[in-house]
């Protein structure tokens, strides 16, 4: 995403971040020398979450809310250096990076309450299907997460072979330049899917915004 | 008022096939997450399938896996269950229900069909 | 698979009375994942409760849920004779969502 503006403000964190953050300190406190297996780590955070309840978990909120404020608040007077605004090129006939368990799920129950709530902003709309994922059980996960999983597997497949054939303008910027880091470039492509994957769902949350129908 | 009926039940020999239909009315069928139970005789309830609001995504018990597909029709606002190879312990009446949310505990059922196997 | 199990198989009482139906899970149960069901003979099975102890649509405040691990309880405060029946917990926290074999309430 090249080297963004240091004035810009920090990105607002979420409830599950300022979780994770608590669970890294924690850890370093009773660990100061042990170096930490991320995968390990993230996967007991992940469980350790699952299990919380509402309440243990209402002190994260708070401090997501409260992030979000002051992020909203220094937006406000963030002026955002000349040229920033220009969209990285995308190629149209790039393999789209497939959807989350969770995105999955969102498609099936977006209508329901969509049409049960048919004044809900679609910030409010997303709310509820996060909590009715986090409320949802792990077994009833279990098809979005299998279909997730089928679509990734395709997805490398697919990204493996587009990157195989090469990109349609690599030809033209010279081989030396196009081999310039294969490992950040990869980085900033999975950033990239990952925010169109975040713009992909908004744009389906204002299609829908415009054809709207008990709990 | 929602309402659930089940059709297709009768007497079946072992091997055979069968499709079960609920009919749902009363609510947004679409909207939501719909399964069979079934009850066989002097026995409790043993769930048998369920099937996401879209009919995308679908799950089942061991003793229906390789045998027994659900289906839905949103624009018909029916639930099926397509039966094969039937065997004398799948006797039983089989309800369909609605799950309230998106787990698996259902606040609707029918009144039941009951499939009889036997030669 | 997880294993719902009930005590006792048949419970005798009479209107008026408190009824305290069990239910046993063979290993340990977030409660959010418990419900429990009314059935009447001929008729569609009802939910009373799910998540532990949330009464469904309808259900009357004399039916109430409570329980953890695996020890979760149906408790009727006073038998109102529409209340006979057989009673049903389920786990719905891990597939294959099992019931128990059921409490049969009857008239003593």
């Known amino acids: 995403m090249g080297k963004g503006d240091p004035k810009k403000p920090r990105g607002k964190m979420s409830s599950y971040a300022f979780f994770v953050q608590t669970c890294r300190e924690e850890h370093k406190k009773k660990h100061p020398d042990a170096s930490v297996n991320f995968s390990e780590f993230s996967k007991k955070c992940s469980e350790r979450w699952k299990t919380m309840s509402a309440k243990e978990k209402g002190k994260f909120e708070d401090m997501a809310k409260a992030d979000k404020a002051r992020y909203e608040r220094e937006m406000k007077t963030y002026i955002p250096p000349k040229g920033e605004t220009k969209k990285k090129f995308k190629d149209p006939n790039a393999p789209k990076r497939p959807p989350s368990a969770f995105f999955l799920f969102c498609s099936e129950y977006r209508p329901k309450i969509k049409g049960e709530h048919p004044g809900l902003s679609i910030g409010d709309v997303a709310k509820k299907l996060g909590e009715m994922w986090n409320n949802t059980a792990a077994d009833d996960k279990q098809p979005y997460e299998k279909k997730a999983a089928k679509l990734k597997e395709k997805y490398e497949k697919d990204i493996a072979a587009y990157r195989a054939k090469g990109k349609p303008d690599a030809a033209k910027k010279g081989v030396v330049k196009a081999e310039k880091s294969k490992k950040k470039k990869e980085e900033e492509e999975d950033e990239e899917d990952e925010e169109d994957e975040e713009e992909e769902e908004d744009e389906e949350d204002e299609d829908e915004e415009e054809d709207d129908d008990d709990e | 008022e929602v309402q659930l009926l089940e059709s297709g039940g009768g007497l079946v020999q072992p091997g055979g096939s069968l499709r079960l239909s609920c009919a749902a009315s009363g609510f947004t069928f679409s909207y939501y997450m719909m399964t069979w139970v079934r009850q066989a005789p002097g026995k409790g309830l043993e769930w048998v399938s369920s099937?996401?609001?879209?009919?995308?995504?679908?799950i089942y018990a061991d003793s229906a896996k390789g045998r027994f597909t659900i289906s839905r029709d949103n624009s018909k606002n029916t639930l099926y269950l397509q039966m094969n190879s039937l065997r004398a312990e799948d006797t039983a009446v089989y309800y369909c229900?609605?799950?309230?949310?998106?787990?698996?505990?259902?606040?609707?059922w029918g009144q039941g069909t009951l499939v009889t196997v036997s030669s | 698979d997880i294993q719902m199990t009930q005590s006792p198989g048949t419970l005798s009482l009479s209107p008026g009375e408190r009824a305290t139906l069990s239910c046993r899970a063979s290993e340990s149960l977030t409660s959010t994942y418990v419900a429990w069901y009314q059935h009447k003979p001929g008729q569609a099975p009802r939910l009373l409760i799910h998540g532990g102890s949330t009464r469904a649509t309808g259900i009357p405040v004399r039916f109430s849920g409570s329980g953890s691990g695996t020890d979760f309880t149906l408790t009727i405060a006073t038998l109102e004779p529409e209340d006979f029946a057989v009673y049903y917990c389920q786990q719905y926290g891990s597939s294959p969502y099992t019931f128990g074999q059921g409490t049969k309430l009857e008239i003593k």
């Open positions: 099937i996401s609001p879209s009919g995308g995504y679908t």
């Open positions: 229900a609605r799950a309230l949310s998106t787990g698996s505990f259902w606040d609707y």
